[in-house]
Amino acid sequence: KESCDVQLYIKRQSYHSIFAGDPFKLECPVKYCAHRPQVTWCKLNGTTCVKLEGRHTSWKQEKNLSFFILHFEPVLPSDNGSYRCSANFLSAIIESHSTTLYVTDVKSASERPSKDEMASR
């Protein structure tokens, strides 16, 4: 029978190259059965993952999957780094792989990098 464990589908070594000053949505795909778990985002600081408080988050529902979204409105240079989502399910904590944001500061860069340059990162 199908497993009813909560699963977080962030791919290992995933990353996003984004611009400061523009909005971005970081999605954590969540699979669950009956009750939606409590999900949080944290940002890695060395080996510690610091829980993000007072941030704009929301849920998006698709057919067989829900997405817990961390909103960046807009992205800031300090948002550069690695993030992890975690779910609290039946008193257990399930952690995702980390996903990394590479933030380009468009004010310090001479111009926005081209799509080719971004693809080569």
């Epitope: 400061a20 523009d22 909005p23 408080e53 007072g54 704009h56 807009p74 240079p77 004010k107």
Partner: antibody, heavy 120, light 106 residues
Framework: QVQLKESGPGLVAPSQSLSITCTVS????????VHWVRQSPGKGLEWLGV???????SYNPAPMSRLSISKDNSKSQVFLKMNSLQTDDTAMYYC??????????????WGQGTSVTVSS | QIVLSQSPAILSASPGEKVTMTCRAS?????MHWYQQKPGSSPKPWIY???NLASGVPARFSGSGSGTSYSLTISRMEAEDAATYYC?????????FGGGTKLEIK
């Protein structure tokens, strides 16, 4: 230097639409966001929405269905369109530049505002 | 949406007096901005990100706070400080303003 200047119709009839143009100078719309904020005696300051540098928009969910923000980078202009105006949309409408520092975002330069009265 | 409640609504102070106004948020926010507005003018940035004074703001102004409680303080009131001060949060859409504190000179 950084400047933003709003131009609007002044008077709008109820149920009609409002169009305001914000013309900016001293910065590029591809690097900075431009926000729309209104101020009415009854509601105080209310953030309406923003045109982000990359061309995406974010809106205040309350008046969102009536709002549309667009821009023309080459003309350094940002446009606000609001449909189905009612008397409580009477306000001063400001366009405002948004800027980020390392770890925060704020609205720094404000236009002088354009007064909009909704009346028949 | 995050509601910002400013108190007091009206504040009267004598020159040289210490002034403190507060802004309380209905939910925790990362930081608070403050704007000053005088009659007939647009709002001006006054304090960024809780405690950073905007360019040209006198050093007698300061800001502090965290979570749901923030404040703006003037160490010694001067006549030119008479204005309405608005707090503003940029943590969650819609990005809201407080109702303002009108500061008057006695």
């Amino acid at each position: 230097q950084v400047q933003l200047k709003e131009s609007g119709p002044g008077l709008v009839a109820p149920s009609q639409s409002l169009s305001i143009t914000c013309t900016v100078s001293g910065f590029s719309l591809t690097t900075y966001g431009v926000h729309w904020v209104r101020q009415s005696p009854g509601k105080g300051l209310e953030w309406l929405g923003v045109m982000w540098p990359g061309g995406r928009t974010s809106y205040n969910p309350a008046p969102m269905s009536r709002l549309s923000i667009s821009k023309d980078n080459s003309k350094s202009q940002v446009f606000l369109k609001m449909n189905s105006l009612q008397t409580d949309d009477t306000a001063m409408y400001y366009c405002v530049r948004g800027d980020y520092e390392y770890d925060y975002y704020a609205m720094d330069y404000w236009g002088q505002g354009t007064s909009v009265t909704v009346s028949s | 949406q995050i509601v910002l409640s400013q108190s007091p609504a009206i504040l009267s102070a004598s020159p040289g007096e210490k002034v403190t106004m507060t802004c309380r948020a209905s939910s925790s926010v990362s930081y608070m901005h403050w704007y000053q507005q005088k009659p007939g003018s647009s709002p001006k940035p006054w304090i960024y990100a809780t405690s950073n004074l905007a360019s040209g703001v006198p050093a007698r102004f300061s800001g502090s706070g965290s979570g749901t409680s923030y404040s703006l303080t003037i160490s010694r009131m001067e006549a030119e400080d008479a204005a309405t001060y608005y707090c503003h949060q940029w943590s969650s859409n819609p990005y809201t303003f407080g109702g303002g504190t009108k500061l008057e000179i006695k």
